[in-house]
């Protein structure tokens, strides 16, 4: 099974995305019909166990010898992987302050809905993206970023917060999802796996990528995050998959080279300002979009997720540095810090390009299963 390819005359090569049928009919993924990762019963928030068994056996995809993000999602093969009884690495720990239920963690107690009831909501993130079910929305225009090229001073805080590495961004980074949909960037952080284990949060037809970057934004309609939580469109996250490539990514190296300084949980350092947009794919025109939630407690909903079709390339050494440098709580490595994919529950993922069109010889007619819901279409 291959992700669909776009027409060869497509300027940037093609894309893939995928979605659950909002009607919940036979196109809804089940354990049998797609290699997507299913959530273990009653364990919405355990990463690893829902990880596609044997994903490390997926064929390696060699990037095209172009620029940083020349690999597109539709270039990735997906395979039915055999069952793998191996337990995921457990990066859990015992809370240092007893049974305080506010101390959430990956891969164990307390259940996230006990930490925050919103984590049991119906429209949670991350999700599995299925290309054939994405709704092409021509109204989704290229993203606009302004002020993302930061000068070296003032320096920025890079912190190991125990569940990710986070770069706090200064005021002035403006992003627009479209006319009247304006946001300010607040922070960025990463999600990753472990040696031989991918760790992206979103998946594409069940394929989990090595890592994922999230740039979190606040709507200009709100002054503070606490006012925007749970409000539709109050927060927006730009997400991109990180993929292995042949060359070192110089933009990421500015952060990765500093991870040793913050190996210990809670530690922080100051790093010179950098071009934040260089951490993202270069193609701002092809992406998937849906409404979901924060992927960590409090799991507030109403978050607009924009997942780039193009991936970002890091060297194997850089990906190893990311997944093997930081320490989390309880003397455990900070690894596998991703949430299980969550059910769509009728949501349709929209695509800014015809991601669901299959131009391979076997498809006589392009098929688009879902209609665009965007205003103006």
């Amino acid at each position: 099974q291959r992700l669909p390819r776009m027409q060869e005359d497509s300027p940037l090569g093609g894309g893939s995305s995928g979605e659950d049928d909002p009607l919940g009919e036979e196109d809804l993924p089940s354990e049998e019909d797609s290699p997507r990762e299913e959530d273990p019963p009653g364990e919405e928030d355990l990463p690893g166990e829902e990880d596609l068994p044997g994903e490390e056996d997926l064929p390696e995809v060699k990037p095209k010898s172009e620029e940083e993000g020349s690999l597109k999602l539709e270039d990735l093969p997906t395979v039915e992987a055999p069952g793998d009884p191996q337990e995921p690495q457990n990066n859990a720990h015992r809370d240092k302050e007893g049974d305080d239920q506010s101390h959430w963690r990956y891969g164990g107690d307390p259940p996230w809905p006990r930490v925050s009831p919103a984590c049991a909501g119906r429209f949670q993130s991350p999700v599995d993206i299925r290309p054939q079910l994405a709704a092409f929305c021509p109204a989704l225009r290229p993203l606009e970023l302004l002020g993302f090229q930061l000068p070296p001073l003032p320096e920025l805080r890079l912190r190991n917060n125990g569940h990710s590495v986070q770069l706090t961004l200064p005021p002035g980074l403006e992003m627009a999802l479209g006319p009247g949909r304006e946001y300010r960037a607040l922070q960025l952080h990463l999600h990753w796996g472990a040696a031989g284990r991918p760790g992206s949060e979103h998946t594409v037809e069940g394929h989990r990528f090595p890592a994922e970057i999230h740039v979190v934004h606040l709507s200009t309609a709100f002054a503070r995050v606490d006012e925007a939580l749970g409000r539709p469109g109050g927060l927006a996250v730009l997400a991109a998959f990180l993929e292995e490539g042949p060359e070192e990514n110089s933009a990421y190296e500015q952060l990765l080279s500093r991870l040793e300084e913050i190996a210990e949980e809670g530690s922080e350092t100051q790093v010179p300002g950098l071009d934040i947009s260089a951490l993202l794919p270069s193609d701002f025109s092809r992406y998937f979009q849906y409404e979901g939630s924060l992927t960590t407690p409090p799991c507030a909903q109403g978050v607009i997720w924009t997942v780039f079709n193009q991936t970002v390339m890091l060297s194997a050494k850089q990906l190893h540095t990311l997944s093997d440098t930081l320490w989390g709580p309880g003397d455990s490595r900070l690894q596998l810090n991703f949430r299980a994919t969550q059910p769509l529950n009728g949501r349709v993922i929209e695509a800014s390009f015809p991601a669901g069109v299959d131009s391979s010889p076997r498809a006589a007619e392009p098929v688009q299963l879902n209609s665009c819901l965007a205003a103006g279409d």
Epitope: H103, S116, R159, L186, V225, G266
Partner: nanobody, 117 residues
Framework: QVQLQESGGGLVQPGGSRRLSCAAS???????????VAWYRQAPGKQRELVAV???????KYSDSVKGRFTISRDSAKNTVLLQMNSLKPEDTAVYYC????????WGQGTQVTVSS
């Protein structure tokens, strides 16, 4: 709108103790349950420096200058974060600020701690 308020500052003799409190108010969200919370301090003419931080997992980290003397703790039920300061030294004199990293930075107004005989 969430607001942070520090309290507990004042004049203390060298070798003495003080407990600072950071309280969050103004929103139903229990911000300290989901934020890494830190105490920073700034002495006159110096840069603001990290003193202690407690993460969402309950992990704690201290600057070398206060390790073994200061303890940070969180009471999520009361929505407060405490900084217990023991064996205070004159060089601990500074304005102490509470910071909550909750997708964005929230800061308090600061409380003055003066260590002097």
């Amino acid at each position: 709108q969430v607001q942070l308020q520090e309290s507990g500052g004042g004049l203390v003799q060298p070798g003495g103790s003080r407990r600072l409190s950071c309280a969050a108010s103004g929103n139903s969200v229990n911000i300290f349950s989901f934020a890494a919370v830190a105490w920073y301090r700034q002495a006159p003419g110096k840069q603001r420096e990290l003193v202690a931080v407690i993460t969402t997992t309950g992990g704690t980290k201290y600057s070398d200058s206060v390790k073994g003397r200061f303890t940070i703790s969180r009471d999520s039920a009361k929505n407060t974060v405490l900084l217990q300061m023991n064996s205070l030294k004159p060089e601990d004199t500074a304005v102490y600020y509470c910071n909550a990293d909750y997708l964005q930075d929230y800061w308090g107004q600061g409380t003055q701690v003066t260590v002097s005989s």
